[in-house]
């Protein structure tokens, strides 16, 4: 069963800065990746970035830098200020589409143990609630 993992990390040096990493564990090639916050895109969530392997990357504030890490994983840096700033319990979702087979997604948020005043966890565990 294809799975998606999501990791969320708050940068210790910039308390309003988050790094979201997502990966696809399926065997198919990725056609499109959508990253959203506040819930899944289309279910109350707001799109932060869309990554297409050929057409490139599109991102919206407060997303600062979205990029492919590998052929099946991406990362996104968020930098917020004021109303658009993410908070510690913000949910981030990644949806990987492998056309025409289907789409798989998962959501995650900052691990409860993360203390913004201390160093951010170097390798937060992927969340298990993945479809």
């Amino acid at each position: 069963t294809p799975e998606v993992w999501v990791q969320v990390r708050m940068e210790a040096t910039e308390l309003s800065s988050f790094t979201i990493r997502c990966g696809f564990l399926g065997s198919g090639s990725i056609s499109l990746v959508t990253v959203s916050w506040g819930g899944p895109n289309g279910a109350g969530g707001t799109t932060l970035a869309v990554l297409h392997p050929e057409r490139g990357i599109r991102q919206w504030a407060p997303a600062r830098q979205a990029r492919w890490e590998t052929q099946s994983s991406i990362s996104l840096i968020l930098e917020g200020s004021g109303a658009s700033s993410p908070c510690a319990n913000t949910t981030f979702c990644c949806k990987f589409a492998s056309f025409p087979e289907g789409s798989w997604e998962a959501c995650g948020s900052l691990p409860p143990s993360s203390d913004p005043g201390l160093s951010a966890p170097p390798t937060p565990a992927p969340i298990l609630r993945a479809d």
Epitope: P2, L32, N41, V50, A97, F99, D131
Partner: antibody
Framework: EVQLVESGGGLVKPGGSLRLSCAAS????????LSWVRQAPGKGLEWVSE????????YYPDTVTGRFTISRDNAKNTLYLQMSSLRAEDTAVYYC????????WGQGTLVTVSS | DIQMTQSPSSLSASVGDRVTITCKAS??????VAWYQQKPGKAPKLLIY???YRFTGVPSRFSGSGSGTDFTLTISSLQPEDFATYYC?????????FGGGTKVEIK
């Protein structure tokens, strides 16, 4: 061979409820997101809902939000659409479909909302 | 929501003709557009996905092109079994949206 078979359609009065089912076979059901798409008589296609492979995430257009609920039973290889507060404009053939986009479709089941 | 505007709504053509149907998205959908064929009383069938990829078993006379907001389905040499209604659909974001359809009739 991928097969999707819808059932549960019929005549219902405005304000009534109905539950559609879609029995799937020929593929690993729990690995795929599924959707419902409808088509009013003589009209075009309208996407109605989507559910992720594990059932965690669901999506609806504004036209049915709060009235329709999509669900699935991966143990039974069955997709459901619970429809309530039905209106005349919900009259349509309802298809279940697999994939993104919709590579496989059922034959459809007709829902008629009329007094 | 992304609107998909399809044209023409209907056309008449003869066997062997080259037929072109266009679809315009209200915003950039990259290459995430699919095309379906539907015959009366039947479920739609996926022909093309991601703008230009033919789905399993689809004849090579069907092709798709475009990107961004403008997309085209071409039937290079119309066959008797191709007389049907064709729909475009964006599979870029939710809600999924379809064009209004193009009915291809016999001239």
């Amino acid at each position: 061979e991928v097969q999707l078979v819808e059932s549960g359609g019929g005549l219902v009065k405005p304000g009534g409820s109905l539950r559609l089912s879609c029995a799937a076979s020929g593929f690993t059901f729990s690995s795929y997101g599924l959707s419902w798409v409808r088509q009013a008589p003589g009209k075009g296609l309208e996407w109605v809902s989507e559910i992720s492979s594990g059932g965690t995430y669901t999506y609806y257009p504004d036209t049915v939000t709060g009235r329709f609920t999509i669900s699935r039973d991966n143990a039974k290889n069955t997709l459901y659409l619970q429809m309530s507060s039905l209106r005349a404009e919900d009259t349509a053939v309802y298809y279940c479909a697999r994939g993104d986009p919709f590579g496989y479709w059922g034959q459809g089941t007709l829902v008629t909302v009329s007094s | 929501d992304i609107q998909m505007t399809q044209s023409p709504s209907s056309l008449s053509a003869s066997v062997g003709d080259r037929v072109t149907i266009t679809c315009k998205a209200s915003q950039d959908v990259m290459t995430a557009v699919a095309w379906y064929q539907q015959k009366p009383g039947k479920a739609p069938k996926l022909l093309i996905y991601s703008t230009s990829y033919r789905f399993t078993g689809v004849p090579s006379r069907f092709s798709g092109s475009g990107s961004g907001t403008d997309f085209t389905l071409t039937i290079s040499s119309l066959q008797p079994e191709d007389f049907a209604t064709y729909y475009c659909q964006q599979h870029y974001s939710t809600p999924r949206t379809f064009g209004g359809g193009t009915k291809v009739e016999i001239k």
